[in-house]
């Protein structure tokens, strides 16, 4: 058999669907979560009303070698308009608590639920 | 000095499918994501899409999913993008756009005209 | 398919303030769409103005600013300047992509 060019492309993901992979994958992270996520790293907390995506991104990519947050690391980079790198805190204008990852990704996943049962895909 | 230089027109048959670059200088591609927007004679802007240079990750609008193809080559610091299946409503001047946090759509190329005549 | 509704013209006079709105049509604008503003000058000259609602990119003048009033991303300028006679574009991202509204002509007399 003969693979032929690369991946094939997926059709357009909707916010909505979008929305709620991101949502079932904070789930898996937090049901599936027996030793401390990420062996208890600590990350920036954020403002879940102020442009939070890219802010969760920021915070989150600082966080290396931790495959249980790479596919949400992944899913955040294509939920924020600019790039983000590691060290980068241009979104977190406020930095000043620090939260385990995994008290992070709960804040992240309720308030991402409220969002979507108030229909707010953006 | 930041510069984008996009490819000259194109005339291209209905049908047919057009590649237009955008090369970099002043900066790495790697480091941004490059966006591509559409501009129609008389009309507004239509964003097609964006590609993280560096991995080759790209998000598309709906409408342009099955029409664009984005992709760049960072050794010669230029990003791509293919149209495919050109019809007329693809006539248009097409513009690459440098986006960051801290300089979001500063820097455009100075767009390439794309003709689709038979 | 969201829509993003801008004003169609605007006029002011220099030294006057003028606000520019950027309206979707899935609700309330926030601060994850990211709310941008572009400027097109004659020959197809852009620059981008304000991104992340109310970040003024390098070199802008001081006298433009975004933010968000009541369910609306706004541009606002504050001092009018004839060299300000432009169209304004304003761009919210929807969770994976842009949609651009249909500009507006800001005329300066």
């Known amino acids: 058999l003969t693979c032929l060019g690369g991946f094939a492309s997926p059709g357009p993901v909707p916010p909505s669907t979008a929305l709620r992979e991101l949502i079932e994958e904070l789930v898996n992270i937090t049901q599936n979560q027996k030793a401390p996520l990420c062996n208890g790293s600590m990350v920036w907390s954020i403002n879940l009303t102020a442009g939070m995506y890219c802010a969760a991104l920021e915070s989150l990519i600082n966080v290396s070698g931790c495959s249980a947050i790479e596919k949400t690391q992944r899913m955040l980079s294509g939920f924020c308009p600019h790039k983000v790198s590691a060290g980068q805190f241009s979104s977190l204008h406020v930095r000043d608590t620090k939260i385990e990852v995994a008290q992070f990704v709960k804040d992240l996943l309720l308030h991402l639920k409220k969002l979507f049962r108030e229909g707010q895909f953006n | 000095e930041v510069q984008l230089q996009q490819s000259g027109a194109e005339l291209v048959k209905p049908g047919a499918s057009v590649k237009l670059s955008c090369t970099a200088s002043?900066?790495?591609?790697?480091?941004?994501?490059m966006h591509w927007v559409k501009q129609r004679t008389e009309q507004g802007l239509e964003w097609i899409g964006r590609?993280?240079?560096?991995?080759?990750?790209?998000k598309y609008a709906p409408k342009f999913h099955d029409k664009a193809t984005l992709t760049a080559d960072t050794s010669s610091n230029t990003a791509y993008l293919q149209f495919s299946s050109l019809a007329s409503e693809d006539t248009a001047v097409y513009y690459c756009?440098?986006?960051?946090?801290?300089?979001?759509?500063?820097?455009w190329g100075q767009g390439t005209l794309v003709t689709v005549s038979a | 398919q969201a829509v993003v509704t801008q004003e169609s013209v605007l006029t002011t006079s220099p030294g006057e303030t003028v606000t520019l709105t950027c309206r979707s049509s899935?609700?309330?604008?926030?601060?994850?769409?990211?709310a941008n503003w572009v400027q097109e000058k004659p020959d197809h000259l852009f620059t981008g103005l304000i991104g992340?609602?109310?970040n003024r990119a390098p070199g802008v003048p001081a006298r433009f600013s975004g933010s968000l009033i009541g369910d609306k991303a706004a541009l606002t300028i504050t001092g009018a300047q004839t060299e300000d006679e432009a169209i304004y574009f304003c761009?919210?991202?929807?969770?994976?992509?842009?949609?651009f509204g249909s500009g507006t002509k800001v005329t300066v007399l």
């Open positions: 002043g900066f790495n591609i790697k480091d941004y994501y």
């Open positions: 899935t609700g309330a604008v926030t601060t994850s769409n990211y």
């Open positions: 992340g609602t109310n």
């Open positions: 756009t440098r986006y960051d946090y801290y300089g979001p759509f500063a820097y």
């Open positions: 590609i993280d240079p560096e991995d080759g990750e790209t």
């Open positions: 761009a919210l991202w929807y969770i994976n992509h842009f949609i």
